[in-house]
Interface confidence: low
């Protein structure tokens, strides 16, 4: 009989006995010669390694590639397959030899003590008891005990085969503790060795791989995969692995049972696959299959093997993130990399640390984003092995719904002199800038704050008949100026102005600003009076420690009893859009002030002087005058703002720079402070003087050095000073290149 596929050039080895089956008697000599076309080897039963003393394999004397196998005095146990094969190939010729030994018809096992057969209680499963025969045509039955039962071949599911053993449905002998085969020869009974029957379970609950997913390694690293099978009791498990590079030299497989708690209804088995130094060919799907004979469960995971440690940003990494003030912002660091990189976040170059407002990790999370969070966030990925870094900048733009600056000044009804031209402003801060600012108005009398129409939190506007400013029928003649843009307190703001040509009617005006993320509004009470008039001397906002006078001028023939008051601490909460009670009707909230009276030919002038104004002097000042005829009181309110003294600060930095000879340098130094600071420039600590090449503009804010020369190199300092001190910034300007020699004729 031949085994294996014939190759192109080799014939099968040829045996001297040209039979598939040979039957010989015990105690005779077995001799078979094998001839071929290259180096040959023999394999024989029981001892497959060739070290048995009784077996002799010799080279033939009459030719190359020829070997003779000789066994003198054969015994029943020599029964089996004898194979002659070419080394390192599958090409082989086989003969099955029966050594008839009627005193020992069963081939004894190596242990010669007892065997074990494993069975499952399954109707469809058969079990083979391996009692092989040295005689092919024996009458064999199977004895099971206890209680004793005998099973004879029935030509169907119970059978005996000399090369295989006794086959029987496993459930038939599952009750038994042991079984053996029995042969009758000439009324003589011969028994095989005993086989202990072990009933095993088969149910596998699950197979789990660890790590279960996302396994990444780089070439040369060790891969360790654990496969755990959980089964019912009495289960034996066979593990089988499938993986990309199955011919791996550095592969190691270790299988073991895991201890489970006593009383547990479950067993655990573990198979560990280890590859000491992975290569790219080890990348792929790894499948662990656990089999109990009747049941197989498997699990798979993908192992990615990188050429070397690396890190790169994923294609989904954002470059621009937009958010609205107050929102939670999440910026994930999307990367491709092995091993996972260390992630560090920076804002405008400064490392970010996690706290209660910000979490800087795999995802940068800002709990409640504010405007100051706007900026460039750099995420730096560092490969922990190669230390290679990759950086990516994400610009965070925080949108701000429109905020109207004047709205924060809680002031009562300002009074405006009849017939005067007045300008109302709404200074809007919004990001992005508002796409429109609209003005609306309504008559004050339509919105009278009568007791019957008490303003409440639930009804902040007792009137809502707002009209467009284009329709000024019955009101003041209005003109809306084109929006202006101004840098106020370091912020770009939009200023919308409404010009009332002649203040004839008391009214309410509302500005409404809208941008992509929201809206804001401000209601201005425009109360027109023919009464006194307040002016400020000097006519500007005072700064702390400066002096200011408030002048109240009234026509002497119409008014008398001029008195200055200051509105006390806010008497009632002012709700959004609420109109305060007219001050003349509520003198309880006013504090009387000392003032000096002057008169000219037509007017009385009551002057209230504030020397060394302080922040406490801010507030609403009321001038009260009484009509000589009707005795009706007229009030005028003026809000006074005192600017805080602020030491000079310089916004932004001067950058060190390198410039070539002949080029120009332009730098800016923006300073703020109150009083406004004076700006001076120094080079190498010497005052910088303007000349043809050095130009200072905009109150020394901008410095230009034209056609730079080598001697312009040095340390430049911008210094901003006021009575409150100085601030300075420095930068070093390097001038490159050789100085051209100038020939003056």
């Amino acid at each position: 009989a031949s085994v294996g596929l014939p190759s192109v050039s080799l014939d099968l080895p040829r045996l001297s006995i040209q039979k598939d089956i040979l039957t010989i008697k015990a105690n005779t000599t077995l001799q078979i010669t094998c001839r071929g076309q290259r180096d040959l080897d023999w394999l024989w039963p029981n001892n497959q390694s060739g070290s048995e003393q009784r077996v002799e394999v010799t080279e033939c004397s009459d030719g190359l590639f020829c070997k003779t196998l000789t066994i003198p005095k054969v015994i029943g146990n020599d029964t089996g397959a004898y194979k002659c094969f070419y080394r390192e190939t599958d090409l082989a010729s086989v003969i099955y030899v029966y050594v008839q030994d009627y005193r020992s018809p069963f081939i004894a096992s190596v242990s010669d003590q007892h065997g074990v057969v494993y069975i499952t209680e399954n109707k469809n499963k058969t079990v083979v008891i391996p009692c092989l025969g040295s005689i092919s045509n024996l009458n064999v039955s199977l004895c099971a005990r206890y209680p004793e039962k005998r099973f004879v071949p029935d030509g169907n599911r119970i059978s005996w085969d000399s090369k295989k053993g006794f086959t029987i449905p496993s459930y038939m002998i599952s009750y038994a503790g042991m079984v053996f085969c029995e042969a009758k020869i000439n009324d003589e009974s011969y028994q095989s060795i005993m086989y202990i029957v072990v009933v095993v379970g088969y149910r596998i609950y699950d197979v789990v791989l660890s790590p279960s997913h996302g396994i990444e390694l780089s070439v040369g690293e060790k891969l360790v995969l654990n496969c755990t099978a959980r089964t019912e009791l009495n289960v034996g498990i066979d593990f089988n692995w499938e993986y990309p590079s199955s011919k791996h030299q550095h592969k190691k497989l270790v299988n073991r049972d895991l201890k489970t708690q006593s009383g547990s209804e479950m067993k655990k088995f573990l198979s560990t696959l280890t590859i000491d130094g992975v290569t790219r060919s080890d990348q792929g799907l790894y499948t662990c299959a656990a089999s109990s004979g009747l049941m197989t469960k498997k699990n798979s995971t993908f192992v990615r093997v990188h050429e070397k440690p690396f890190v790169a940003f994923g294609s989904g990494m954002e470059s621009l993130v937009e958010a609205t003030v107050g929102e939670r912002v999440r910026i994930p660091a999307k990367y491709l990399g092995y091993p996972p990189p260390e992630i560090k976040w920076y804002k405008n170059g400064i490392p970010l640390e996690s706290n209660h407002t910000i979490k800087a990790g795999h995802v940068l999370t800002i709990m409640e984003v504010s405007e100051r969070d706007t900026g460039n966030y750099t995420v730096i990925l560092t490969n922990p092995i190669s230390k290679e870094k990759q950086s990516h900048v994400v610009s965070l733009v925080v949108y701000v719904p429109p905020q109207i600056g004047e709205k924060s000044l809680i002031s009562p009804v300002d009074s405006y002199q009849y017939g005067t031209t007045q300008t109302l402003t709404c200074t809007v801060y919004a990001i992005p800038p508002p796409h429109h600012i609209h003005w609306y108005w309504q008559l004050e009398e339509e919105c009278a704050n009568e007791p019957s129409q008490a303003v409440s939190v639930t009804n902040p506007y007792p009137c809502e008949e707002w009209r467009s400013v284009e329709d000024f029928q019955g009101g003041n003649k209005i003109e809306v100026n084109k929006n202006q843009f101004a840098l106020i307190e370091g912020k770009n703001k939009t200023v919308s102005t409404l010009v009332i040509q002649a203040a004839n009617v008391s009214a309410l005006y509302k500005c409404e600003a809208v941008n992509k993320v929201g809206r804001g509004e401000r209601v201005i009470s425009f109360h027109v009076t023919r009464g006194p008039e307040i002016t400020l001397q000097p006519d500007m906002q005072p700064t702390e420690q400066e002096s200011v006078s408030l002048w109240c001028t009234a026509d002497r023939s119409t008014f008398e009893n001029l008195t200055w008051y200051k509105l006390g601490p806010q008497p009632l909460p002012i709700h959004v859009g609420e109109l305060p009670t007219p001050v003349c009707k509520n003198l309880d909230t006013l504090w009387k002030l000392n003032a000096t009276m002057f008169s000219n030919s037509t007017n009385d002038i009551l002057i209230m002087e504030l020397k060394n104004a302080s922040l406490q002097d801010q507030g609403d000042y009321v001038c009260l005058a009484q009509d000589r005829k009707t005795k009706k009181r007229h009030c005028v309110v003026r809000q006074l703002t005192v600017l805080e003294r602020v030491a000079p600060t310089i916004t932004g930095n001067l950058e060190n720079q390198t410039t070539s000879i002949g080029e120009s340098i332009e730098v800016s130094c923006t300073a703020s402070g109150n009083p406004p600071p004076q700006i001076m420039w120094f080079k190498d600590n010497e005052t910088l003087v303007e000349d043809s090449g050095i130009v200072l503009k905009d109150g020394n804010r901008n410095l230009t050095i034209r056609r730079v020369r080598k001697e312009d190199e040095g340390l430049y300092t911008c210094q901003a000073c006021s009575v409150l001190g100085c601030a300075k910034v420095e930068a070093f300007f390097i001038i490159e290149g050789a100085q051209e020699k100038t020939n003056l004729e």
């Epitope: 690396f310 940003f313 294609s315 990494m317 470059s319 491709l336 290679e388 950086s391």
Partner: antibody, heavy 121, light 110 residues
Framework: EVQLLESGGGWVKPGGSLRLSCAAS????????MTWVRQAPGKGLEWVSY????????YSADSVRGRFTISRDNAKNSVYLQMNSLRAEDTAVYYC??????????????WGRGTMVTVSS | LPVLTQPPSVSAAPGQKVTIPCSGT????????VSWYQQLPGTAPKLLIY???KRPSGIPDRFSGSKSGTSATLGITGLQTGDEADYYC???????????FGEGTKLTVL
């Protein structure tokens, strides 16, 4: 003007070497990964190699790995392809390409005109 | 074997609509942005679509891109004779860790 200009192509015998250059202008070169793509006569586009902004990471197609080396000089706004052990199958038009986004490996919105490399004996 | 599969050729009459499919796998099309390129005879490729469905400025809205699962599609409406060209899809492949192009599709305007 934003552009890429390749040079250095020509005829070479199998086993020989060539160095291709790509000069970039009109954009912040050091902010972009740079890529070489080739196209054999009558065939489709084949990605050859790319290099990250600082030149620390390079990836190459299996067909050229070990023979071709990509490098860059950010000061000169240039990217190079050193081609050694050239084979007949390396005959192609070689394009230099820039990805659409900074710090991104692909999606090429800027291409050079290409330079022809012919490998034959 | 090509990583991204495209039909070798497609054809349609002027004014008609044509679609060019590009088939890939989980590691490329599913996980990454797809871009499309047009290569007119004798010229360098030109970016038509990026990020699956976005058009660079200057690309008419007759060209559109879409992606679903492991497939991406380039659509061209109102075909013109000037659209006769080779069209390539491209994307990053996470497993191969390299950029991959489709084999290319020749568009003929009948």
């Amino acid at each position: 003007e934003v552009q890429l200009l390749e040079s250095g192509g020509g005829w070479v015998k199998p086993g020989g070497s060539l160095r291709l250059s790509c000069a970039a202008s009109g954009f912040p070169f050091s902010d972009y990964y740079m890529t070489w793509v080739r196209q054999a006569p009558g065939k489709g586009l084949e990605w050859v190699s790319y290099i990250t902004t600082g030149g620390r990471i390079i990836y190459s197609a299996d067909s050229v790995r070990g023979r071709f080396t990509i490098s860059r000089d950010n000061a000169k706004n240039s990217v190079y392809l050193q081609m050694n052990s050239l084979r007949a199958e390396d005959t192609a038009v070689y394009y230099c390409a820039r990805p659409l986004r900074e710090l991104s490996p692909g999606g090429f919105d800027l291409w050079g005109r290409g330079t022809m490399v012919t490998v034959s004996s | 074997l090509p990583v991204l599969t495209q039909p070798p050729s497609v054809s349609a009459a002027p004014g008609q609509k044509v679609t060019i499919p590009c088939s890939g796998t989980y590691s490329n099309i599913v996980n990454n942005y797809v871009s499309w390129y047009q290569q007119l005879p004798g010229t360098a490729p030109k970016l038509l679509i990026y990020d699956n469905n976005k058009r660079p400025s200057g690309i008419p809205d007759r060209f559109s891109g879409s992606k679903s699962g492991t497939s991406a599609t380039l659509g061209i409406t109102g075909l013109q004779t000037g659209d006769e060209a080779d069209y390539y899809c491209g994307t990053w492949d996470n497993s191969l860790r390299r950029w991959v192009f489709g084999e290319g599709t020749k568009l003929t305007v009948l």
